[in-house]
């Protein structure tokens, strides 16, 4: 692959972890102890896109799976999905825009803004065990702030 990737996990600002919920969905819930092993490990790739000091374009794949988070219109609404790709061709420098997120670091917290849909962010609900989704509001009920934990490769 012509791009660099790091392995990491993400937790939202309420310390909920992300786990698989069926083959093509993530959900957020509190995990403890051995259950932490259920959390999804992402392969975060540094890809082409608009960049500034605190905004870095990344793609979020699931480690050792040919699945990437992507942003598409469904029923005219920006929607987060897990999309299957050909592992021979991914990750790559010029990822299609639907796969690209702007990783924004503010006060040691991370936001992931869709490059395809500006001002739409990877989000979780306050409630437990709910799907991870693409939200169009910041600072409301839904959670858009995450922390990243590095995982040994």
């Amino acid at each position: 692959a012509p791009v660099r990737s790091l392995n990491c996990t993400l937790r939202d600002s309420q310390q909920k972890s992300l786990v698989m919920s069926g083959p093509y969905e993530l959900k957020a819930l509190h995990l403890q102890g051995q259950d932490m092993e259920q959390q999804v490990v992402f392969s975060m790739s540094f890809v082409q896109g608009e960049e500034s000091n605190d905004k870095i374009p990344v793609a979020l794949g699931l480690k050792e799976k040919n699945l990437y988070l992507s942003c598409v219109l469904k029923d005219d609404k920006p929607t987060l999905q897990l999309e299957s790709v050909d592992p021979k061709n991914y990750p790559k420098k010029k990822m299609e825009k639907r796969f690209v997120f702007n990783k924004i670091e503010i006060n040691n917290k991370l936001e992931f803004e869709s490059a395809q849909f500006p001002n739409w962010y990877i989000s979780t609900s306050q409630a437990e065990n709910m799907p991870v989704f693409l939200g169009g509001t910041k600072g409301g009920q839904d959670i858009t702030d995450f922390t990243m934990q590095f995982v040994s490769s």
Epitope: P2, R4, L6, E51, S153
Partner: antibody, heavy 120, light 107 residues
Framework: QVQLQESGPGLVKPSETLSLTCTVS??????????WSWIRQPPGKGLEWIGY???????NYNPSLKRRIAISVDTSKNQFSLRLSSVTAADTAVYYC????????????WGQGTTVTVSS | SSELTQPPSVSVFPGQTANITCSGD??????ACWYQQKPGQSPVLVIY???KRPSGIPERFSGSNSGNTATLTISGTQAMDEADYYC??????????FGGGTKLTVL
């Protein structure tokens, strides 16, 4: 502001092992998102990448040198080190350490370099 | 191939534009960067991620990368830009590869 400083012997005998250390100040070798590299430059020649380590991963080495090199880290001293075994005169060079932010795809901070001569 | 090829030397008059090329197989599919090195000094990163300038690097330095060629462009070249310039690229099989370097002479 991150600074790097190489240290080690300036003269090494052929067939011996060259050991160099890079001390990091103003930052941490254990912070994620950075590669920490060694590069060398023989007299009058170009730059040659030796290898790097990433704190959450395994070191990666230049395939042409792989059998002779090892890069390790000492987080307690905030240092990383290079060992190059079975040296010959061809290993005479200025050796640099550098920081490479993962998303930069380039080395943004370099040490001042240390000259190593291989001679008996 | 992981090789990066640069012209050994480029000459330019002060105030003119200098273009230094770096060629390699499918280089445009990789990220390229450029370093400036003056005699007796450590290299300095002048372009990263194909076309980004680190803080402190003058605006006259720019970069591009497509196809098999990355290019460092110095607009309005000054005497102080005389130096050796190295391109570098990365991929997961060879990791870091440097070009052979180009000596820029300001006439």
């Amino acid at each position: 502001q991150v600074q790097l400083q190489e240290s080690g012997p300036g003269l090494v005998k052929p067939s011996e092992t060259l050991s160099l250390t890079c001390t990091v100040s103003g930052g941490s070798v254990s912070s994620g998102g950075y590669y920490w590299s060694w590069i060398r430059q023989p007299p009058g020649k170009g730059l040659e990448w030796i290898g790097y380590f990433y704190y959450s991963g395994s070191p990666n080495y230049n395939p042409s040198l792989k059998r002779r090199i090892a890069i390790s880290v000492d987080t307690s001293k905030n240092q990383f080190s290079l060992r190059l075994s079975s040296v010959t005169a061809a290993d005479t060079a200025v050796y640099y350490c550098a920081r490479d932010p993962m998303h930069y795809y380039g080395m943004d901070v370099w040490g001042q370099g240390t000259t190593v001569t291989v001679s008996s | 191939s992981s090789e990066l090829t640069q012209p050994p030397s480029v000459s330019v008059f002060p105030g003119q534009t200098a273009n230094i090329t770096c060629s390699g197989d499918k280089l445009g599919d990789k990220f390229a960067c450029w370093y400036q090195q003056k005699p007796g000094q450590s290299p300095v990163l002048v372009i990263y991620r194909d076309n980004k300038r680190p803080s402190g690097i003058p605006e006259r330095f720019s970069g591009s990368n497509s196809g098999n060629t990355a290019t460092l462009t110095i607009s309005g070249t000054q005497a102080m830009d005389e130096a050796d310039y190295y391109c570098q690229a990365w991929d997961s099989s060879t990791y870091v590869v440097f070009g052979g370097g180009t000596k820029l002479t300001v006439l």
